[in-house]
Interface confidence: low
């Protein structure tokens, strides 16, 4: 007699380890013999899928090698055309020993920064992650924490954090260890003992002392007035990550001697500098507020504007003065492409002479600022329209960068050529050609042949600007 299908052994939850075999049994009584189909998460399992074996007229479903993605609800459905189809469902829970999917890697980090050693794991039940430093379990503290992901985060890395680390992933099925990795803590170069300034008699010997530390141990170089030391002897010793350098000099002229300690962090360098002056008794007194050196201009942007082989002031508040000042000019120069033909050469002359100021190479190299009258000539005569537009943009916050402000002088703060003609630099490009007041003669020397006629003084200025904006 025909009999509707009945499932005599309902499906149950099956636990299986990754790469092991898992079997679901769906025993059915019926007549005629039923057709049995299987689904996973409501998607039909195809009979020809080689990852599965379906036997006993469809009553046995075997997963031949369980993967972690096989998790889900499996159902068998039996139908023989008599009565309705019947269904039974059960879950497959894939159990997995811990596995480290993203192991930690060697890390070099600069002291004070944040270090993260990755350790991403897989496993069911979810593994717990701990860390070992050296031979001991790592204890979490205010700076050290194991994140939800298993990664180790160390805030404000200190020298003592350096060492060998490994992560450990553990669940009820087993334990996995990562390979040992190294955390190296690097420390910026720092000068421990700066060279001292000396005032000596002509022809004496002086020893300048400079001590520095860092990880890796820095190298020390000595600079004399902006150039590599050409004479004198240097003795160095290294002990306990401290380098000690002594420069012995025979003094025949005053100079500014800079000790530069440099160490390398990946592709970047860290540099610490300390300077000392060696003056000769009865030579002129050094000025103390200028930090820089005189050097021939060797850039490109201002080649046509500055005098050939001009001696310019390079500001050592930049790590790389020559490049920093050149890039500063370059950035501002690009903005000058759009200004009027009258303004452009004047603005270029002002820009180059402001960023690369003429340098007086005394005991302490001194920059010579542009004369106020020339600055005002650019501002109020040649580039009045553009200057106003720039101030307006600054006022309305349209400039995203402060960089252009560095390349625009404050005219009112510059010395007047009427106070002391030698205390400020003139801009030859701005000196009028009497036949044609709008031309800029080619530069033949750094001194103008004609004084600028009727230059507006700051008092007769056609407009003024609040000092809040450093454009005046």
């Amino acid at each position: 007699l025909p009999k509707a299908p009945v499932i005599t052994t309902p499906l149950e939850t099956v636990d299986a380890l990754v790469e092991e075999v898992a079997t679901f049994m769906c025993a059915v009584e019926s007549y005629p013999q039923p057709e049995i189909s299987w689904t996973r998460n409501k998607i039909l399992i195809k009979l020809f899928d080689t990852r599965y074996s379906i036997r006993e007229n469809g009553q046995l479903l075997t997963i031949l090698s369980v993967e972690d993605s096989d998790d889900g609800i499996y159902c068998c459905t039996a139908n023989n055309g008599v009565g309705g189809a019947v269904e039974s469902c059960g879950a497959l829970q894939v159990k997995m020993k811990p596995k480290i999917t993203r192991p930690p890697i060697n890390v070099k980090i600069i002291e004070g920064l944040k270090a993260v050693l990755p350790c991403t794991t897989m496993g069911n039940p979810k593994p717990s992650v701990s860390w070992i430093k050296g031979d001991s379990p790592l204890r979490e503290n205010s700076r050290t924490a194991v994140l939800e992901s298993g990664s180790l985060r160390i805030h404000n890395v200190q020298k003592e954090d350096a060492g060998q680390y490994r992560c450990v992933a553990k669940n009820s099925l087993g334990t996995a260890y990562s390979k040992v990795v190294k955390l190296e803590v690097e420390v910026f170069a720092r000068i421990l003992r700066a060279p001292e300034s000396h005032n000596v008699t002509f022809g004496s010997f002086v020893t300048l002392h400079c001590t520095a530390t860092g990880i890796p141990v820095p190298t020390i170089t000595w600079i004399e007035n902006g150039n590599a030391v050409s004479s004198g002897s240097i003795q160095e010793s290294v002990k306990d990550r401290v380098i000690d350098s002594r420069l012995q000099l025979f003094i025949t002229k005053p100079g500014l001697y800079t000790c530069i300690a440099t160490n390398k962090h990946g592709e970047k360098f860290s540099t610490a500098k300390a300077a000392a002056t060696v003056s000769i008794a009865e030579w002129s007194k050094p000025q103390k507020d200028n930090k820089g050196y005189c050097a021939q201009y060797r850039g490109e942007v201002c080649n046509a504007v500055l005098a050939k082989d001009a001696l310019v002031f390079l500001n050592t508040s930049y790590a790389d003065p020559e490049e920093a000042q050149e890039l500063l000019v370059h950035t501002a120069w690009n903005e000058l492409k759009v200004v009027s033909p009258l303004c452009r050469p004047a603005a270029e002359a002002l820009l180059c002479n402001h960023v690369f100021q003429e340098c007086s190479p005394g005991v302490v190299p001194t920059p010579i600022p542009i004369c106020r009258e020339y600055c005002l000539a650019v501002k109020e005569l040649f580039c009045a329209k553009e200057w106003l537009a720039m101030e307006e943009k600054t006022h309305r916050g349209l400039y995203r960068s402060e960089m252009h402000l560095l390349s625009v002088p404050e005219c009112s703060k510059l010395p007047s050529m009427h106070w002391d003609p030698t205390a400020c630099a003139r801009l030859p490009h701005l000196d009028y050609n009497k036949e044609n007041p709008k031309t800029f003669p080619p530069m033949t020397s750094s001194k103008p042949s004609v004084d600028i006629p009727n230059l507006p003084s700051s008092s007769s200025s056609s407009f003024s600007v609040s000092p809040t904006y450093s454009m005046t």
Epitope: A228, E267, F269, T271, R298, G299, E300, V301, N303, A319, D320, E322, E323, E326, L327, H330, W333, N334, K337
Partner: antibody
Framework: ELQLVESGGGLVQPGGSLRLSCAAS????????MSWVRQAPGKGLEWVSA????????YYKESVKGRFTISRDNAKKTLYLQMNSLKSEDTAVYYC??????????????WGQGTLVTVSS | QAVVTQEPSLSVSPGGTVTLTCGLS?????????PDWYQQTPGQAPRTLIY???SRHSGVPSRFSGSISGNKAALTITGAQPEDEADYYC????????????FGGGTKLTVL
């Protein structure tokens, strides 16, 4: 006489590494920026990387960023190019070139004879 | 990203004048791109001819000159010689970031 002599080229498999060196003589090495320029067989020149006089900053062509590292040892008067994760398209003659000033982007005013790098399996 | 464009090939008669140009796929070449020109003969390393638009490198004959004309950089050879037959490359400074310095594809110059 100013001379730039490259070395370190050769045959390497894809994914491999090479370190090129450029020994400089006849000029004050630490006064000038330096560059690497390459030329694939039968193709044009291609700027690869640059470094200023003091190694304080580095510049790279986009396609080599993260794989190539330029460095210099001023005491040894040597420029280096460490090339990792090499690809077949990195096959080229690599020229070391001197810049006209300290900055990294000055004109190239002196060239070495080049060293051939072949990346092939 | 801007591409530096050059004529693939040009020819000139001995003693004649020829101008090679160097442009940008997007925009104009200006003095702020500091155009440089290099010459390369087969099997040889490149040689610097002109740097920063119009400065002749030492030892370069005066028949080579550089300029910016319209929206392109130009290399002019006045009174071409047979030994001027070579590949000529221009290179432009493109500002900060990546690909700071970009070469053109080169111009093959034939002196017929």
């Amino acid at each position: 006489e100013l001379q730039l002599v490259e070395s370190g080229g050769g045959l390497v498999q894809p994914g491999g590494s090479l370190r090129l060196s450029c020994a400089a003589s006849g000029f004050t090495f630490d006064d000038y920026g330096m560059s690497w320029v390459r030329q694939a067989p039968g193709k044009g020149l291609e700027w690869v990387s640059a470094i200023p006089w003091n190694g304080g900053s580095t510049y790279y062509k986009e396609s080599v960023k993260g794989r190539f590292t330029i460095s210099r040892d001023n005491a040894k008067k040597t420029l280096y190019l460490q090339m990792n994760s090499l690809k077949s398209e990195d096959t080229a003659v690599y020229y070391c070139a001197k810049r006209s000033g300290r900055i990294a982007f000055g004109a190239l005013d002196a060239w070495g004879q080049g060293t051939l790098v072949t990346v092939s399996s | 990203q801007a591409v530096v464009t050059q004529e693939p090939s040009l020819s000139v008669s001995p003693g004649g004048t020829v101008t090679l140009t160097c442009g940008l796929s997007s925009g104009s070449v200006t003095s702020s791109n500091y155009p440089d020109w290099y010459q390369q003969t087969p099997g040889q390393a490149p040689r610097t001819l002109i740097y920063t638009t119009n400065s002749r490198h030492s030892g370069v004959p005066s028949r080579f000159s550089g300029s910016i004309s319209g929206n392109k950089a130009a290399l002019t050879i006045t009174g071409a010689q047979p030994e001027d037959e070579a590949d000529y490359y221009c290179a432009l400074y493109m500002g900060g970031g990546s690909n700071v310095y970009v070469f053109g594809g080169g111009t093959k110059l034939t002196v017929l």
